[in-house]
Amino acid sequence: PPRGRILGGREAEAHARPYMASVQLNGAHLCGGVLVAEQWVLSAAHCLEDAADGKVQVLLGAHSLSQPEPSKRLYDVLRAVPHPDSQPDTIDHDLLLLQLSEKATLGPAVRPLPWQRVDRDVAPGTLCDVAGWGIVNHAGRRPDSLQHVLLPVLDRATCNRRTHHDGAITERLMCAESNRRDSCKGDSGGPLVCGGVLEGVVTSGSRVCGNRKKPGIYTRVASYAAWIDSVLA
């Protein structure tokens, strides 16, 4: 089953997020991803946990998953590099870099997104954009077209409260509010974009969606700048 959903969002403007990727398993959407370099897509490590025998590909330039679009192209994956410290039972270090079989053909609908390198928290209350093809309601309806939602960043202390994530949110993670509008599982790997810069990647741990006491959890890319640079080098 696909990992992820955007709840309470709306259809995105077509191709307005040219960095957006769909990580696919055997031809079906599995997770979100974000193009960070011509030949590299950043996603979440947990996305590939159950993909051992399947064919992993990356769809770029898409708005609709099913309809033909001139900018759409499916790329094979040359190499999958999960963060070395990622583990199945924790949300920590939930990052994955996918090297495409060739450099992506860039254009208005396919373009890498600048990512944050300065290791400083995004100010609480900042509105950030998260997008994905995950299910759009609790009944499990899957959208064909890309959805997005604007979410305010939540301070880490609140996110670490016992009734929220009870101390699980390290300095390498960040949270966004989840009051009916939310990302969830299968938007996993997708981008959290603040001020036009990639700040976070949707984690793929199982989590109640749309409940304000269980905020969305995002891996802070700035905290992993050294690792990302070392893989892309």
């Epitope: 880490r156 202390a157 609140t158 409260r161 016992r162 009734t163 009870d166 949110i169 300095e171 006491k213």
Partner: antibody
Framework: EVQLQQSGPELVKPGASVKISCKAS????????KNWMRQRHGESLEWIGD????????NYNQKFKGKATLTVDKSSSTAYMELRSLTSEDSAVYFC?????????WGHGTLVTVSA | DVLMTQTPLSLPVSLGDQASISCRSS???????????LEWYLQKPGQSPNLLIY???NRFSGVPDRFSGSGSGTDFTLKISRVEAEDLGVYYC?????????FGGGTKLEIK
């Protein structure tokens, strides 16, 4: 190593105020709420209130509204609790505790004795 | 406020025995998010409390597996399978699901 270092014992007169401190180390101060508890001699614990160290927003047990005021100083990673209009009923050990996970980390407690 | 009632008040045991402490809440302590924030703490004389169990049955890191928590709704139990000398002290249950959070009155575990 997470540590919460509380200020020393206080002997105060009835009607006076006292401000006790809880200095955090071993973690990022602003990443966790700070809670305060009271324990009278031989009795159980009572929750006084909590404070978000990012913005100073505090929540209080109704029972302690007007009695306790919680503040923080981010620059010194210290949480404070001021108790006012003290009576002998306020004589107790006061604990600070970090919230997350649960109350896994506590200060050693500050004994406040109210006596003429 | 949610009243947390512990029984017994005092529990004399022999080392190696099993001990069981009950905690009852005056209303359900299932939080609106679906979780139950019932915790157990041990306070040794002259010390601050130590977290043993969180969310009813989860042992905090470093807590020996002879400690186990169970229960739901309004009735909860802490069991110590084989009491050791270092286990002596006062045990408190705590609910963090409703504001204000509240502690039980405590159960003193002592040598028979």
């Amino acid at each position: 190593e997470v540590q919460l270092q509380q200020s020393g014992p206080e002997l105060v007169k009835p009607g006076a105020s006292v401000k006790i401190s809880c200095k955090a180390s071993g973690y990022t101060f602003t990443d966790y709420y700070k809670n305060w508890m009271r324990q009278r001699h031989g009795e159980s614990l009572e929750w006084i209130g909590d404070i978000n160290p990012n913005n100073g927003d505090a929540n209080y047990n109704q029972k302690f509204k007007g009695k306790a005021t919680l503040t923080v100083d981010k620059s010194s990673s210290t949480a404070y609790m001021e108790l006012r209009s003290l009576t002998s009923e306020d004589s107790a050990v006061y604990f600070c505790a970090r919230e997350g996970p649960s109350f896994a980390y506590w200060g050693h407690g500050t004994l406040v004795t109210v006596s003429a | 406020d949610v009243l947390m009632t512990q029984t017994p008040l005092s529990l004399p045991v022999s080392l190696g025995d099993q001990a069981s402490i009950s905690c009852r809440s005056s209303q359900t302590i299932v939080h609106s998010n679906g979780d139950t924030y019932l915790e157990w703490y041990l306070q040794k004389p002259g010390q601050s409390p130590n977290l043993l169990i969180y969310k009813v049955s989860n042992r905090f890191s470093g807590v020996p597996d002879r400690f186990s928590g169970s229960g739901s709704g309004t009735d909860f139990t802490l069991k110590i399978s084989r009491v050791e000398a270092e286990d002596l002290g006062v045990y408190y249950c705590f609910q963090g699901s409703h504001v204000p959070p509240t502690f039980g009155g405590g159960t003193k575990l002592e040598i028979k």
